[in-house]
Structure formats: structure tokens, C-alpha cells
């Protein structure tokens, strides 16, 4: 194929790929009609002057997991018809100015995880098609100024993984097209008013795992096309009224891991077309009546790990379309007998983890479709009869770690788990709490020693241990992990992870369908 | 139907107690909060606090703090408002009231009338 | 505590008019806002809750707007029976606290 060098191969679809360790300089002599060139994983330490002269047609080029620490300027002359460069996980501190000059169809430029101390406005300023920057994992601490003044076609730029303090709400003024825009992991305090207001075409605005304490109440107010917003792991305390007010298009918010200890009214909406909501790991004491409203189409609301000890009747007014709750590891002793009523959708609902003492027996009433219940963990003794009599779809009824008072009261309650057990499935089963005669045996075998009450309830039929969800869609777009599960760590939907890890610890968010932002 | 049925008016000297006692009916009784509301002569309404007659926890009026005492009776379906250190301006109207199907109130008792005078 | 400041205090109008009664709370209380008219002797009665959604057997002539700050209650066609006391009241944080109520009267 018009000359291989001996440690690459070469396809007949012109792509060439060189990788090894006993590689330390650009093979030669490249195919001169190679369109595709990967040099990874070899231990080239510099790029000299026009390693790439006589492949003028090349349109890719990945030089990625290298040990390159050095590049001449004239390294990539002549490639005027690149349109894709990766120099990714180098060890790459300094970039040459004019280092870009000529290459006038780069649309993708990949400098991530290297060791960048800077960046300066003259090294992108000859880029004036590109699309893609990415500059994740580096060690930038500041932006100049005019650094992506002459990016106008830029549709998306990641920042990520830096050590940025602070940006000027200059920076990104003149990419107008720009629709994704990621801040993630670094050291942001606090973010101007103004600083995104010339992204009128963004989408996803990733700024989770940083510092910001407070957010402008006119911040987004420019974004009306944003449709993802990741404000996880932060400092933030309160949330203006007006922050979120003109986001229509917004379908997925991350608040989890921030120090909110209130939501206050009206604050989300109108979003119509908001799907997820992610509010664990806060400081939320209560929520008032109408709170979630304006959030019509909602499917996931993540409330876990708060303090939240009141919910008034009203709170989920307005959630018709909510499939997942979930409100475990809060202080919660008492819910109001209508504090479900809108519900009607529910399919799963996480209780674990709080104080409730009783449940009013219409608690699900409307709530026909919930096929998971978690209320292990509370300080339920006995439940009212038929409670989830006419629910039946339910196939995961979590009771176990409860104080259940065995006398004959529980009869009722026993019969039915009897005729139920497939629903509670066989990790761990209630056992009794008292009398102490019988403390620590299975309330399902349990014998009372006093005349059985006629109690009729309705033939279900067997239903697998755990819920079967049908036509759930891989990862990234939801993660399907058993209600017992949690991911170990949070992750975005654009992360690279191939594998997510699951753990078996009950303490967290007991939802069917896990996934953070 | 949901009703609140009262007890009848009271009159009380200065540093006395009173208290007030609310039957319902019409639907089950633990399962939904109770609040207390009360109305001095020529003044505006005044919240005090409620009650979740499932577990017997309450929340109370910073105001009212330390002064009342809201209770429950299961097995009756009644609730109660004890007020204690009685002064002229607790002269009011206390009504009882549980919410609907949000934090406003639904339905209301017939009010009791306590009148405090030396 | 968030005040509810409620004017007029007191209005007189004759049947067939349309009355307005504003509120205005001392802090955003959302769309957590309650009407309630009381007549002499009787225990309020719930007209309007979450601002603007009127009470199941509430006549259509009443009808709340606002969210914020502020609300209005609008009789558009007072009838003799309408002549009473009307509160508004805020839920959305404790302690829960009422306006001073507007009085409405017969010309």
C-alpha cells in the first residue's frame, strides 16, 4: 500500500496505524495517499518540523497515549485538508503559537488530559472552522480574554477536569453556536452575570464539581435552547426565584450534592419538558404545596439523603407523568394521607431509610401502576388493611428493618405477605420486633396464638423477584440497576465510561432506575 | 362526609388553661393533619400549629410556643388545643381545620369561643 | 413570618358589581395562596386555593389570579350573599399567616 512502514499497518481504505512501545519518532515513509494516520501508545517524546509533508491528503490524525512533551511549530504543514487532530493524553504542557496555522478544515481539535498551563487567543485564531475543542484534564488556571474570539462555528467545548478559578464573562461572547459547553471539576466559585449570554444556541452546560456558592438570578436567562444543565457537587445554598425561569427546552437538572436548604416557590418552571430531577445529598428540610408544579412532563425526582421532615399535601401537585420517587434517607415520621393523590403514574417509590411510624391506608390509593415500594428501614409496626390490595402490578415490596408488632393486629398484614412472598423477595424477610416472646422471627411464618381472622385477600400472580422494565435503554441514557443499588460514583451521560460499577449497599438511593448527572 | 365537631365556649380567669376539644368524623382520622387556627375579636385569622393524629407530632406558632399544647384521642378521632397562662387578648374564636388536598384549609370546625376575664 | 397585607380593609359596593381584593405578601409565597369568606358567627369558608383554582361548589363569579407576591380575588358579579368578611392566607412556609381581611359591604 504505497509503502508501510514496518511498525504500522496499513488498510486498503487508506488508514494507517502505528502503535507500540519500541516506537520513539514518526514512522517513515507514510503512504502518501493515507487519510487516516493513529500513532498511540509508542514513546515518541517530540514532533519535529513536517513529520506529515508527503501525506498532504491525511484527514484524520490521532496522536494519542505518547509520551509527547514537545512540538515544533511546522509540525503539521501541509495537512490543509485535516479536519480532525487528537493529541490527547500526552504529556503536553506548552502549545507552539502558530502550531494550527494552515490547517483551515480542522473541525475537531482534541488537546485533553495533557499538562496545559495556558492558553493564549493567537494559539486558535487561525481556527476559524473548527467545531470541537476539547481541553479537558489539563492544568489550566485561567482563560484570556479573546481565547475563542475567532471560534464562531465552535459547537462544543470542554473545559473540564481544569484548575480554573474564575472565568471573565467575556470568554465565551462570540460562540453563538456553541451547544455544549462543559466546566466540570474545577475550581469555580462563582460564575459573572453575563458570562453565557452569547450562547443562545447551547444545550448542555456542564458545571458540576465545582466551588460556586451562589448563582445570579439572570444567569440562564439567554439559554432558551438549554436542555441539560449539571449543577451537582457545588456549594450552593439558595437558588434565586428567577434562575430558572426562561429554560422551556430544559430536560434534565442535576442539584444533588449542594447545600440547598430550601426550594423556593416556583423556582422550576415553566419547564415543560424537564424529565429529571436530581435533588439528593441537600440540606431540604420540607416541601411546599406546588413546589414541583410547574414541572408537567417530570418522570424522576430524586429527593434522597435530606433532612426533609414535613412534606405538605400539596408538594407533588402537578407530577401526573412521574415515574420514580425517590424520598429515602430523610427524617420523614408522617405523610399526609393525600400527599400521593397526583401520583398516577408512579411505577416506584423509595421510603427506606426514615422514621415513619404508620402509613394512612388510602397512602397509594391513586397510585395504581407502582410496581416498587422500598419502606425497609422505617419504624412501621403494623400496616392498615388492604394497603396494597388493589395494586397489581407490584412486584418489589421492600419491609424488612421495621419493628413489627406481632400480636393480632399483624394477621391481616401476615396473610397477605403469605399469599405475597414472590413481592418481598428472599434477601432479607420482616421479622418481628414484639412481642418479645416472638422477636426475631419471620412475620410471614409467624404463629399467633389467637383465632384467624376471615380475611379475604385477591390471588395474585407469581411475579419475578426483581421488576423486568422492558425496552429500557442502555447506558448512557438511563442505567437499569437493581432498587438495591447505587452507582459509585456519579456520572454524566457524556462520560467515556464503558462499565459502570454497582454496588450492593442499601443505605443509598433504592431507585430501578439509577443514574446522577 | 368530613366534620369537625367542637366543644362548647369557655369562660376562664387570667393564668388558667383551657382546652379545646375537636371530634371528626367522615373519614380516618389518623391519616390526615389537624391544625389549629384562632381569631380575636376584630383581628385577622392566626395560625397556632398542628397535629398528625397517627403518630402525635406537632408543629407550633413560634408565637404560641411554650403555651399550647395540641393532643390527640385515637380511639375517639378527637384532637385537643391546650392553652395555658391564659391572658385577656387569648380571648378569641379557636377553630380546628384539616387541609384538603394541600395546605389550605378544607374543612372547618364550628369554632369555641373562650372568653378570658378576671 | 410573612405578612399578607390585604387592601382595601373594607369596600362598599351594590349587587351586580365587580369587586377586587388585592394581597401582597412580604416575601414570593409561589402560587401558595388561599381565599377564604366568613360571615358573621360561621367558621371561614375556603373559596380559591394555589391562587387561582376555585373550591369544589364555589360559584364561577369568583376567581383568584397572582403568584409572588401578589394576588387578587375578583367577585364579578357580587350577589346579596356575597356581602362578608374575605381573608387571603399564605402555606407555603410556617408559621402559616392570613391577610386582614376585606370587608365587603352593602352600598
Known amino acids: 500500500y504505497h509503502g508501510c512502514p514496518s511498525e504500522c499497518t496499513c488498510s486498503r481504505a487508506s488508514q494507517v496505524e502505528c502503535t507500540g512501545a519500541r516506537i520513539v519518532a514518526v514512522p517513515t515513509p507514510l503512504p502518501w495517499n493515507a487519510m487516516s494516520l493513529q500513532i498511540l501508545n509508542t514513546h515518541i517524546t517530540e514532533l519535529n518540523e513536517s513529520p506529515f509533508l508527503n501525506i498532504s491528503a491525511l484527514i484524520a490524525l490521532r496522536i494519542e497515549k505518547n509520551e509527547l512533551s514537545r512540538i515544533t511549530p511546522g509540525a503539521f504543514r501541509n495537512l490543509g485538508s485535516l479536519r480532525y487532530l487528537s493529541l490527547a493524553n500526552n504529556k503536553l504542557q506548552v502549545l507552539p503559537i502558530g502550531l494550527f496555522q494552515g490547517l483551515d478544515s480542522l473541525e475537531s481539535l482534541l488537546l485533553s488530559s495533557n499538562q496545559l498551563l495556558q492558553i493564549q487567543p493567537a494559539h486558535f485564531s487561525q481556527c476559524s472552522n473548527l467545531k470541537e475543542l476539547q481541553l479537558h484534564g489539563n492544568h489550566l488556571e485561567y482563560i484570556p480574554d479573546g481565547a475563542f474570539d475567532h471560534l464562531v462555528g465552535l459547537t462544543k467545548l470542554n473545559l473540564g477536569k481544569n484548575s480554573l478559578t474564575h472565568i471573565s464573562p467575556r470568554v465565551f461572547q462570540h460562540l453563538g453556536n456553541l451547544q455544549v459547553l462543559r466546566l466540570y471539576e474545577n475550581r469555580l466559585t462563582d460564575i459573572p452575570m453575563g458570562t453565557f449570554d452569547g450562547l443562545v444556541n447551547l444545550q448542555e452546560l456542564a458545571l458540576q464539581q465545582n466551588q460556586i456558592g451562589l448563582l445570579s438570578p439572570g444567569l440562564f436567562h439567554n439559554n432558551h435552547n438549554l436542555q441539560r444543565l449539571y449543577l451537582s457537587n457545588n456549594h450552593i445554598s439558595q437558588l434565586p426565584p428567577s434562575v430558572f425561569m426562561q429554560l422551556p427546552q430544559l430536560n434534565r437538572l442535576t442539584l444533588f450534592g449542594n447545600s440547598l436548604k430550601e426550594l423556593s416557590p416556583g423556582i422550576f418552571g415553566p419547564m415543560p419538558n424537564l424529565r429529571e430531577l436530581w435533588l439528593y445529598d441537600n440540606h431540604i428540610s420540607s416541601l411546599p404545596d406546588n413546589v414541583f408544579s410547574n414541572l408537567r412532563q417530570l418522570q424522576v425526582l430524586i429527593l434522597s439523603r435530606n433532612q426533609i421532615s414535613f412534606i405538605s399535601p400539596g408538594a407533588f401537585n402537578g407530577l401526573t407523568e412521574l415515574r420514580e420517587l425517590s424520598l429515602h434517607t430523610n427524617a420523614l415520621q408522617d405523610l399526609d394521607g393525600n400527599v400521593f393523590r397526583m401520583l398516577a403514574n408512579l411505577q416506584n417509590i423509595s421510603l427506606q431509610n426514615n422514621r415513619l411510624r404508620q402509613l394512612p391506608g388510602n397512602i397509594f390509593a391513586n397510585v395504581n401502576g407502582l410496581m416498587a415500594i422500598q419502606l425497609q428501614n422505617n419504624q412501621l409496626e403494623n400496616l392498615p388493611l388492604g394497603i396494597f390490595d388493589h395494586l397489581g402490578k407490584l412486584c418489589e415490596l421492600r419491609l424488612y428493618d421495621n419493628p413489627w408488632r406481632c400480636d393480632s393486629d399483624i394477621l391481616p398484614l401476615r396473610n397477605w405477605l403469605l399469599l405475597n412472598q414472590p413481592r418481598l423477595g428472599t434477601d432479607t424477610v420482616p421479622v418481628c420486633f414484639s412481642p418479645a416472646n416472638v422477636r426475631g422471627q419471620s412475620l410471614i411464618i409467624i404463629n399467633v396464638n389467637v383465632a384467624v381472622p376471615s380475611v379475604h385477600v385477591p390471588e395474585v400472580p407469581s411475579y419475578p423477584e426483581t421488576p423486568w422494565y422492558p425496552d429500557t435503554p442502555s447506558y448512557p441514557d438511563t442505567t437499569s440497576v437493581s432498587s438495591t443499588t447505587e452507582l459509585t460514583s456519579p456520572v454524566e451521560d457524556y462520560t467515556d465510561l464503558t462499565t459502570i460499577q454497582v454496588t450492593d449497599d442499601r443505605s443509598v438511593w433504592g431507585m430501578t432506575q439509577a443514574q446522577s448527572g | 362526609q368530613v366534620q369537625l365537631v367542637q366543644s362548647g365556649a369557655e369562660v376562664k380567669k387570667p393564668g388558667a388553661s383551657v382546652k379545646v376539644s375537636c371530634k371528626a368524623s367522615?373519614?380516618?382520622?389518623?391519616?390526615?393533619?389537624i391544625n389549629w387556627v384562632r381569631q380575636a375579636p376584630g383581628q385577622r385569622l392566626e395560625w397556632m400549629g398542628w397535629?398528625?393524629?397517627?403518630?402525635?407530632?406537632?408543629k407550633y406558632s413560634q408565637k404560641f410556643q411554650g403555651r399550647v399544647t395540641i393532643t390527640r384521642d385515637t380511639s375517639a378521632s378527637t384532637a385537643y388545643m391546650e392553652l395555658s397562662s391564659l391572658r385577656s387578648e387569648d380571648t378569641a374564636v379557636y377553630y380546628c381545620?384539616?387541609?384538603?388536598?394541600?395546605?389550605?384549609?378544607?374543612?372547618w370546625g364550628q369554632g369555641t369561643l373562650v372568653t378570658v376575664s378576671s | 413570618d410573612i405578612q399578607m397585607t390585604q387592601s382595601p380593609s373594607s369596600l362598599s359596593a351594590s349587587v351586580g358589581d365587580r369587586v377586587t381584593i388585592t394581597c401582597k405578601a412580604s416575601?414570593?409565597?409561589?402560587?401558595?395562596v388561599a381565599w377564604y369568606q366568613q360571615k358573621p358567627g360561621k367558621a371561614p369558608k375556603l373559596l380559591i386555593y394555589?391562587?387561582?383554582y376555585r373550591s369544589s361548589g364555589v360559584p364561577s363569579r369568583f376567581s383568584g389570579s397572582g403568584s409572588g407576591t401578589d394576588f387578587t380575588l375578583t367577585i364579578s358579579s357580587l350577589q346579596p350573599e356575597d356581602f362578608a368578611t374575605y381573608y387571603c392566607?399564605?402555606?407555603?412556609?410556617?408559621?402559616?399567616?392570613f391577610g386582614g381581611g376585606t370587608k365587603v359591604e352593602i352600598k
Open positions: 394555589s391562587a387561582s
Open positions: 397535629i398528625y393524629p397517627g403518630s402525635g407530632n406537632t
Open positions: 381545620a384539616r387541609w384538603g388536598y394541600g395546605a389550605y384549609f378544607t374543612y
Open positions: 367522615g373519614y380516618t382520622f389518623t391519616d390526615y393533619y
Open positions: 392566607q399564605q402555606y407555603n412556609s410556617f408559621p402559616y399567616t
Open positions: 416575601q414570593n409565597v409561589g402560587i401558595n
